[in-house]
Interface confidence: low
């Protein structure tokens, strides 16, 4: 299954990355899975994940740093609470869990650059 | 003439962003022209200029926005007062002015990406 | 590290063919640009055609247009360039190049961090 998302997305300088992934359905799925994984070197690891159904919101966890909402086949996802360190390869997984036949698709990446920003002056 | 420099440099919060253009010097120039070169979209403008004498002081108008200092064959170039609107392309031209032959090398250029910070809050 | 080896370059009469390939190693991202470029001395190198792997969008440069066709092989990680119906002026040194970037437009072409050693390819009237 095919999943398409930007090659490059900058961080703001509050260290949030916006990105759509979009995924080409086969068939009628009603309940789907995302995780975003994150590609740095050769690591690979689970950033976040959701499970929705089609036409509801997307739920994180509580303490996950994603945010996300869907729109048919599309899914517009928001990484917060980024830093400098955190710039590498964003991988979009999507998984059409219900109704069978199950399938499996994986984005080629999205590069996020996060910037750290200058920290304010003190205010006397 | 080939010309080497990174494909991709984050500038910093402040709007300042660093490179090094290395080029293959086929002589032994005593006289080299370093240009920066803004293409963005199908424009291409020039960003600054310097003629230094070998193991001198690279010299940019004092409005400039750009710094720099040489070492061998490497020049090691510092752009600054950069706003989110000025992330492009930004290609590295090296001339070897004399002795002759003249010599031109063109580097692939380097994509500087730039994000505006987020005004600090007012002190009261 | 990439390694980009260029092969397929030579000599040829006006209105002969060609066909370049080159050879990609070491690369991690599965989304990329691949281009054909060519360079004659003391000239700026021209981007003659470029794909991207993402969409499989091409681009060619008006010159070569209808003459020049790029190609790639996923499994070979090989990209081609075949050559027709070759004129003078497309004597030239050829190079291949790679990169995570985008290469809708000639500015994310140009962002292509990784480049081949180029082959020559001479064209006689």
């Known amino acids: 299954m095919h999943v398409a998302q930007p090659a490059v997305v900058l961080a703001s300088s509050r260290g949030i990355a916006s990105f759509v992934c979009e995924y080409a359905s086969p068939g009628k799925a009603t309940e789907v899975r995302v995780t975003v994984l994150r590609q740095a070197d050769s690591q690979v690891t689970e950033v976040c994940a959701a499970t929705y159904m089609m036409g509801n919101e997307l739920t994180f966890l509580d303490d996950s740093i994603c945010t996300g909402t869907s729109s048919g086949n599309q899914v517009n996802l928001t990484i917060q609470g980024l830093r400098a360190m955190d710039t590498g390869l964003y991988i979009c997984k999507v998984e059409l869990m219900y109704p069978p036949p199950y399938y499996l698709g994986i984005g080629n990446g999205t590069q996020i650059y996060v910037i750290d920003p200058e920290p304010c002056p003190d205010s006397d | 003439m080939h010309v080497a420099q990174p494909a991709v440099v984050l500038a910093s919060s402040r709007g300042i962003a660093s490179f090094v253009c290395e080029y293959a010097s086929p002589g032994k120039a005593t006289e080299v022209r370093v240009t920066v070169l803004r293409q963005a979209d199908s424009q291409v403008t020039e960003v600054c200029a310097a003629t230094y004498m070998m193991g001198n002081e690279l010299t940019f108008l004092d409005d400039s926005i750009c710094t720099g200092t040489s070492s061998g064959n490497q020049v090691n170039l510092t752009i600054q007062g950069l706003r989110a609107m000025d992330t492009g392309l930004y290609i590295c031209k090296v001339e070897l002015m004399y002795p002759p032959p003249y010599y031109l090398g063109i580097g692939n250029g380097t994509q500087i990406y730039v994000i505006d910070p987020e005004p600090c809050p007012d002190s009261d | 590290q990439v390694q980009l080896q260029e092969s397929g370059g030579g000599s040829v009469q006006a209105g002969g063919s060609l066909r370049l390939s080159c050879a990609a190693s070491?690369?991690?991202?599965?989304?990329?640009?691949m281009a054909w470029f060519r360079q004659v001395p003391e000239k700026e190198r021209e981007r003659v055609a470029s794909i991207y792997t993402g969409g499989g969008t091409t681009y060619y440069a008006d010159s070569v247009k209808g003459r020049f066709t790029i190609s790639l092989d996923n499994a070979k990680n090989t990209l081609y360039l075949q050559m027709n119906s070759l004129k003078p002026e497309d004597t030239a040194m050829y190079y291949c190049a790679k990169s995570a970037a985008r290469c809708d437009s000639s500015r994310d072409v140009n962002r292509l961090g990784y480049w081949g050693q180029g082959t020559q390819v001479t064209v006689s009237s």
């Open positions: 070491g690369y991690t991202y599965s989304t990329y640009c």
